[in-house]
């Protein structure tokens, strides 16, 4: 048994063009923290399993806010180290997938919304109680170092972590430097030492003065970068400078990246392009799977149909992504037309709309008369910000709905007398007044006052 | 689990009425917007009416307004359309969908088939 | 009202092929516009809304595009559950109305 130990030293934009910004802004804060995901490397089978050797969740980082203008930097990472108990023997090989999540924590809905910046994934030799090993990785634009190890938990010591070895309460007999083993009291065990000079970083032994190289590292004591040892790799103009006189073979010959990869060479290695669902230096390592638990947010995860996708998660109502960890700000596909305010309810979306304006999006025009019915006969009239009915005579009110007394307006004039009618109304007029309201005075002669044509 | 169970399809005759229900599950029913949507046999898909979360708004399309009603009782989680003056053209598997607001139509019933003929 | 015209009616093609179906809009509708997949006997299915976002639940293999009145569904990968009838639907105003629908059909 023992514990694998990952410390994050530095997450932040890569050299280079294209760096990214800060994922954060000052309008939408926001914090980090990883993943890591373990299994054995023992077999391209294994590279398959899921996260067989376990997984860890860091603690949230603290809060980080953009500051306009600056530039990009390592954003402020979570305290402590990532640890990841292992209850059998250390594989010595192992593949590890790291993740790097965002937690927003602006004004959503609901909570703060997650999202996946970036994974990276590889696989190595480590033996356990050795030192820690460095390590960079990049994932697009974004770079992440970090160191890990492997440490046996007492009483089990060894590269594996497989034998025992417990203290003992009677004076030890063992040498100096050398510790009382199970389960033969007077069987004394060496500490594991490397080839003297073995490089602490890139180097490691499983048995007494070996010194074996991490993935990326050559040479009897693991100091020469493979992409530098002897003048095999530069190539061109470059290879005057080691001695060489042919140029030896690139990086990419014979293609190093599995699973169907691409390779591009780097000024000083390669790097492989790795179809969907492949990641680490040499696209060997697999995609997640549903046992690794990717789907958040109470996402449903299911294998995938293709061999592209090893699993698909289902998500809940108000989340998307791949791993659902996206909250969907569905107001900001603005939903709501003709200037309508948008809540999200979390399970459905209201659109409160303005005057003369209506429909489950705003998107009916009140100005428009579609949907709308003026009753007894009553027509529908276009404009000034609402619609407006003309009703048949008789009838009045807003849609026409009310029966209208026709004399409550008073519409003879002069004195005339108004009287209800079943088509209208009837004026009669007092002496020396005539017309259908009473509007024209009648002359003493009996010409009336009509309006010259 | 959203469920939508549309009932009260059958055939009848032209100028004959018909009012067809869904009962809705599995959501705050009183939430949504819902709408009828019918579909002729061997046809596409025409919207038919919505109706607000509380009912005071509905439309329809041109070829029903003033035949067809569009109505709902949120205490008993139920959409109903009843149907008058019905015309051969209205024969159709008539489906009932909720409107969540960022789409009309997320959840659809199963669909009930109306026949008008003779 | 808005008419809604889809390309082609119908379609042919074969198990793991990528296919592209095409919807115009009579008039801009911003991106107000969904994807319906439909198989017989059956209800229709949300796929897309807003022209491109993926309904909850369907699978990245389908994706939209397009703004105004010229949109595109397309649908990678093909697999035997993929081959239906698909209708775009916009809901700029109303009525709202739907493309005639494209069978797409295995090879």
């Known amino acids: 048994a023992g514990v694998f130990e990952l410390q994050i030293h530095s997450f932040g934009p890569g050299p280079g063009p294209g760096a990214p910004r800060s994922p954060c802004s000052a309008r939408l804060p926001c914090r980090l923290f990883f993943r890591v995901c373990l299994k054995p490397g023992l077999s391209e089978e294994a590279a398959e399993s899921p996260c067989a050797l376990g997984a860890a969740l860091s603690a949230r980082g603290p809060v980080y806010t953009e500051q306009p203008g600056a530039p990009a930097p390592d954003l402020p990472l979570p305290d402590g180290l990532l640890q990841v108990p292992f209850r059998d023997a250390w594989p010595g090989t192992f593949s590890f997938i790291i993740e790097t999540w965002r937690e927003e924590l602006g004004d959503q809905i609901g909570g703060p919304a997650w999202s996946l910046l970036a994974r990276v994934a590889g696989r190595r030799r480590l033996a356990a109680g050795g030192p820690w090993a460095r390590d960079i990785q990049r994932a697009g634009a974004w770079e992440l170092r970090f160191s890990y190890r492997a440490r046996c938990e007492p009483p089990a010591v060894g590269t594996a972590c497989t034998r025992l070895c417990r203290p003992r309460s009677a004076p030890s007999r063992c040498g100096p430097g050398l510790r009382p083993c199970a389960p033969l009291e007077d069987e004394c065990e060496a500490p594991l030492v490397c080839r003297a000079g073995c490089s602490p970083e890139h180097g490691f032994c499983e048995q007494p003065g070996e010194c074996r190289c991490l993935e990326g590292w050559t040479g009897p004591l693991c100091t020469v970068p493979v992409s530098t040892s002897s003048c095999l790799s530069p190539r061109g103009p470059s290879s005057a400078t080691t001695g060489c006189l042919v140029p030896g073979p690139g990086p990419c010959d014979g293609n190093p990246c599995a699973n169907g990869g691409s390779c591009s060479e780097t000024p000083r290695s390669f790097e492989c392009t790795c179809p969907r669902g492949f990641y680490g230096l040499r696209c060997e390592v697999s995609g997640v799977t549903c046992a690794d638990g990717p789907c958040f947010n109470g996402g449903l995860c299911v294998g995938g149909a293709d061999p592209d996708s090893a699993y698909i998660c289902h998500c809940p109502p108000g989340f998307q992504g791949s791993n659902c960890e996206k909250r969907v700000d569905r107001c900001s596909l603005q939903p709501c037309r003709n200037g309508g305010l948008c809540l999200d309810l979390g399970h459905a979306l209201r659109c409160r709309c303005r005057a003369g304006f209506a429909g489950p999006r705003c998107e009916h025009d009140l100005d428009d008369c579609a949907g709308r019915a003026c009753a007894n006969g009553g027509t529908c009239v276009e404009g000034g910000g609402a619609h407006r009915c003309s009703c048949a005579l008789g009838f009045g009110g807003r849609d026409c709905r009310e029966r209208a007394d026709p004399c409550a307006a008073r519409p003879c004039a002069h004195g005339g007398r108004c009287y209800a009618h079943f088509s209208g109304l009837v004026c009669a007029c007092a002496p020396g007044y005539m017309g259908a309201r009473c509007e024209f005075p009648v002359h003493p002669d009996g010409a009336s006052a009509l309006p010259a044509a | 689990e959203v469920q939508l169970v549309e009932s009260g399809g059958g055939l009848v005759q032209p100028g004959g009425s018909q009012r067809l229900s869904c009962a809705a599950s599995g959501f705050t029913f009183s939430s949504y917007w819902m709408n009828w949507v019918r579909q002729a046999p061997g046809k596409g898909l025409e919207w038919v009416a919505n109706?607000?979360?509380?009912?005071?708004?509905?439309y329809y399309v041109d070829s029903v307004k003033g035949r067809f009603t569009i109505s709902r009782d949120n205490a008993k989680n139920s959409l109903y359309l009843q149907m008058n003056s019905l015309r051969a053209e209205d024969t159709a598997v008539y489906y009932c969908?909720?409107?969540?607001?960022?789409?009309?139509?997320?959840?659809w019933g199963q669909g009930t088939l109306v026949t008008v003929s003779s | 009202d808005i008419q809604m015209s889809q390309s082609p009616s119908s379609l042919s093609a074969s198990v793991g092929d990528r296919v592209t179906i095409t919807c115009r809009a009579s008039?801009?509708?911003?991106?107000?516009l969904a994807w319906f997949q439909q198989k017989p006997g059956k209800a229709p299915k949300s796929l897309i809304y807003a022209a491109s976002s993926l309904q909850s639940g369907v699978p990245s293999k389908f994706s939209g595009s397009g703004s105004g009145t010229d949109f595109t569904l397309a649908i990678s990968s093909l697999q035997p559950e993929d081959f239906a009838t698909y209708y775009c639907q916009q809901y700029n105003s109303f009525p709202y109305t739907f493309g005639q629908g494209t069978t797409l059909e295995i090879k």
């Open positions: 109706i607000k979360e509380d009912g005071s708004e509905k």
């Open positions: 969908a909720r409107d969540p607001g960022w789409a009309p139509f997320d959840y």
């Open positions: 008039q801009g509708i911003s991106n107000y």
